[in-house]
């Protein structure tokens, strides 16, 4: 039975030619984490394999940096970034878990962070 | 056209090193990650280990951690593997292939190189 | 480790045969299993990644399915061309390959 549950760090904006950190936290488990996958609307970006370590798509290596953890930090950050951001939580015994990120990347200087939330 | 060229054969005294070359073309090896797997005569395949180009970062399998290195030369697009203490179980074609670019997967190999350790 | 284990290991088959490789991991591993063709004196050959995604130049008679430990590799309608050794390797954990099932054309 699968009882853990992913927090993100939910809606989050960001300025055009920023940076920003895409965070996921998997709690309530005790399964083991063998991989996380980050994936942009079916396109994956990066892998944080517990063994191998991180594999960043070639096209993203330029402006995706690895972590903190098994985050993911988006460099150079272009109106086009702007979407729904999956973790993919691979795990023994349990299975995967998923989590979802929105980010809005803004033209003006006004950008806030939105609150954290959980998905069961 | 996309390829990696590895040097060719060699002849080994047990106990001595060895180290085959894997030149890229076609792209830059900073883009992907470089592996090596070996094939004994007859046998399957076996990860080595691999190297992140852009920041030199290695992981290697348990087996051959001590005994294998892995660099690259980015200036010349060419990926290293040098095998220590070599044995005659080593005895083996090595093959570079790349990692796809979605993950831990071999999408271009190169030609492998036999390497024989005999006394 | 997570130790992949083929059937058959060697399978003798006709041209136009439906021919299945069977690939099972000693623990589950979502979908991170790719299939590779090696032929004699050649390098291997990526056919399918991630259980049944194909690979771009690969014929279309080349398939995968599966997830978790329980995994496929299927030839529609085999060719002779088709005579090669497959392997399955998984990127779960640190990376291994299956044994290997040869193929033989009859």
């Known amino acids: 039975m699968m009882t853990g549950t992913i927090e993100t760090t939910g809606n989050i904006s960001a300025e055009k030619g920023g940076s920003i950190i895409l965070q996921c936290h998997l709690s309530s488990t005790t399964a083991q984490v063998t991989q996380v996958n980050w994936e942009q609307q079916d396109q994956l970006l990066a892998i944080c394999n517990a063994d191998l370590g991180w594999h960043i798509s070639p096209s993203f290596k330029d402006r995706v940096a690895p972590g903190p953890g098994l985050g993911l930090t988006l460099q150079s950050l272009t109106v086009n970034d702007t979407g729904e951001y999956f973790c993919i939580y691979h795990t023994y015994p349990d299975g995967t878990y998923t989590g979802r990120i929105f980010l809005e990347v803004l033209e003006s200087s006004v950008a806030e962070h939105g609150a954290r939330f959980q998905i069961p | 056209q996309v390829q990696l060229v590895q040097s060719g054969a060699e002849v080994k005294k047990p106990g001595s090193s060895v180290k085959v070359s894997c030149k890229a073309s076609g792209f830059n090896i900073k883009d992907t990650y470089i592996n090596w797997v070996r094939q004994a005569p007859g046998q399957g395949l076996e990860w080595m280990g691999r190297?992140?180009?852009?920041?030199?970062?290695?992981k290697y399998a348990q087996k051959f951690q001590g005994r294998v290195t892995i660099t690259t030369d980015t200036s010349t697009n060419t990926a290293y593997m040098e095998l220590s203490s070599l044995r005659s179980e080593d005895t083996a074609v090595y093959y570079c292939?790349?990692?796809?670019?979605?993950?831990?997967?071999?999408?271009?190999w190169g030609q492998g190189t036999l390497v024989t350790v005999s006394s | 480790e997570i130790v992949l284990t083929q059937s058959p290991d060697f399978q003798s088959v006709t041209p136009k045969e439906k021919v299945t490789i069977t690939c099972r991991a000693s623990?589950?591993?979502?979908?991170?299993l790719h299939w590779y063709q090696q032929k004699p004196d050649q390098s291997p050959k990526l056919l399918i990644k991630?259980?049944?995604q194909s690979i771009s130049g690969v014929p279309s008679r080349f398939s995968g399915s599966g997830s978790g430990t329980d995994f496929t590799l299927t030839i529609s309608s085999l060719e002779a061309e088709d005579a090669a050794t497959y392997f399955c390797?998984?990127?779960?954990?640190?990376?291994?390959f299956g044994q290997g099932t040869k193929l033989e054309i009859k």
């Open positions: 623990q589950s591993i979502s979908s991170n």
């Open positions: 292939p790349k990692s796809g670019d979605y993950g831990w997967y071999f999408d271009v």
């Open positions: 190297i992140d180009p852009a920041s030199g970062d290695t």
């Open positions: 390797q998984q990127s779960n954990s640190w990376l291994t």
């Open positions: 991630y259980a049944s």
